[in-house]
């Protein structure tokens, strides 16, 4: 009797279990009682990444330079193109359809993780003993100057945005 369920990598149509097309190929015709499924390779600008019964291949993603995108990995008949962002930019989403400039860490914050083409700058507040007095996408919090090692004393305490100010020791006895 005609099957009601099919094996893996098959599909049921007209009471027949037909083979799915392998990745990189599209369906031309379903199998029949007497013939196999017929599949054709996707063209150069197209892909299919699963065993399928699609009659059309998917277009490779276009990495639009006007959106700050560039090709990270060229697509094949079985994989989509992977886009990334140009230097100084990162993707706005996981699918990387557009790019925005990396954010800078404001004074009082330092760079915890430098941005990549797919992730933004991660900032962290400068802890006690560290400061950042610039807005930067690269600079970490810097330690306060150690006045003692210079045989100086702290004249003005540091903050998360300013370094300490060192001065000469009081020579009075």
């Amino acid at each position: 009797e005609p099957p009601t369920a099919c094996r893996e990598k098959q599909y049921l149509i007209n009471s027949q279990c037909c083979s799915l097309c392998q990745p990189g190929q599209k369906l031309v015709s379903d199998c029949t009682e007497f013939t196999e499924t017929e599949c054709l390779p996707c063209s150069e600008s197209e892909f299919l990444d699963t065993w399928n019964r699609e009659t059309r291949c998917h277009q490779h993603k276009y990495c639009d330079p006007n959106l700050g995108l560039q090709v990270q990995q060229k697509g094949t008949s079985e994989t989509d193109t992977i886009c990334t962002c140009e230097e100084g930019l990162h993707c706005t989403s996981e699918s990387c359809e557009s790019c925005v400039p990396h954010r800078s860490c404001l004074p009082g914050f330092g760079v915890k993780q430098i941005a990549t083409g797919v992730s933004d700058t991660i900032c962290e507040p400068c802890p006690v003993g560290f400061f950042s007095n610039v807005s930067s996408a690269f600079e970490k919090c810097r330690p306060w100057t150690s006045c003692e090692t210079k045989d100086l004393v702290v004249q003005q305490a540091g903050t998360n945005k300013t370094d300490v100010v060192c001065g000469p020791q009081d020579r009075q006895r």
Epitope: S19, V28, S29, D30, T32, E33, F34, T35, E36
Partner: antibody
Framework: EVQLQESGPGLVKPSETLSLTCTVS?????????WNWIRQPPGKGLEWMGY???????NYNPSLKNRVTISRDTSKNQFSLKLSSVTAADTAVYYC?????WGQGTTVTVSS | DAVMTQTPLSLSVTPGQPASISCRSS???????????LNWYLQKPGQSPQLLIY???NRFSGVPDRFSGSGSGTDFTLKISRVEAEDVGVYYC?????????FGQGTKLEIK
């Protein structure tokens, strides 16, 4: 219900070309399947002659030595057989078939 | 070509008794996907062949369940569990895995 019906002359002279047409109803010959011609000489078994596919491409039995051509007219949902340089050995009942559905067959006699 | 050899060429069976026909191919009929395209037909006297079994063991629609097909590779069998008077005719196997498609020479079933 898929139906196939052969038509054409029942008598062909030796050395001439045998021409038959198969009219299909209930299914488009461009949708899928292979559309075959099969013959059966009197009192003998079945012989596959060739097919035309849903996409118009062909395959023929090499035993017929390039004498066979199968073509189609998609506007009429018909496919046709031509067999050239016939001899008495080509006398047979000729069937068109989708392999699950067959025509009733038409007898062709080759005689002068 | 895949040469199809049927045995026996004729058999005479009492109604209600079983019957078995063998079909052997000169080459494997299993394709690269693991599918085997072997059909069985019955040609009743004065009629076109009718499909009984396709892909070795699948009964065509409307075919009684007393007909069954089995086999793999090069050896195939058609079984009739209980022969009835209407089963008389010539049985053919046909392979459509390889081009040219080829028929067995036929097995004539008679009723005792």
């Amino acid at each position: 219900e898929v139906q196939l019906q052969e038509s054409g002359p029942g008598l062909v002279k030796p050395s001439e070309t045998l021409s038959l047409t198969c009219t299909v109803s209930g299914y488009s010959i461009t949708s899928n399947y292979y559309w075959n011609w099969i013959r059966q000489p009197p009192g003998k078994g079945l012989e596959w002659m060739g097919y035309i596919r849903y996409d118009g491409s062909n395959n023929y039995n090499p035993s017929l030595k390039n004498r066979v051509t199968i073509s189609r007219d998609t506007s009429k949902n018909q496919f046709s057989l031509k067999l050239s340089s016939v001899t008495a050995a080509d006398t047979a009942v000729y069937y068109c078939a989708r392999l699950d559905y067959w025509g009733q067959g038409t007898t062709v006699t080759v005689s002068s | 070509d895949a040469v199809m050899t049927q045995t026996p060429l004729s058999l005479s069976v009492t109604p209600g008794q079983p019957a078995s026909i063998s079909c052997r191919s000169s080459q494997s009929l299993e394709n690269t996907n693991g599918n085997t395209f072997l059909n069985w037909y019955l040609q009743k006297p004065g009629q076109s062949p009718q499909l009984l079994i396709y892909r070795v063991s699948n009964r065509f629609s409307g075919v009684p369940d007393r007909f069954s097909g089995s086999g793999s590779g090069t050896d195939f069998t058609l079984k009739i569990s209980r022969v009835e008077a209407e089963d008389v005719g010539v049985y053919y196997c046909l392979q459509v895995t390889h081009v040219p498609f080829t028929f067995g020479q036929g097995t004539k079933l008679e009723i005792k």
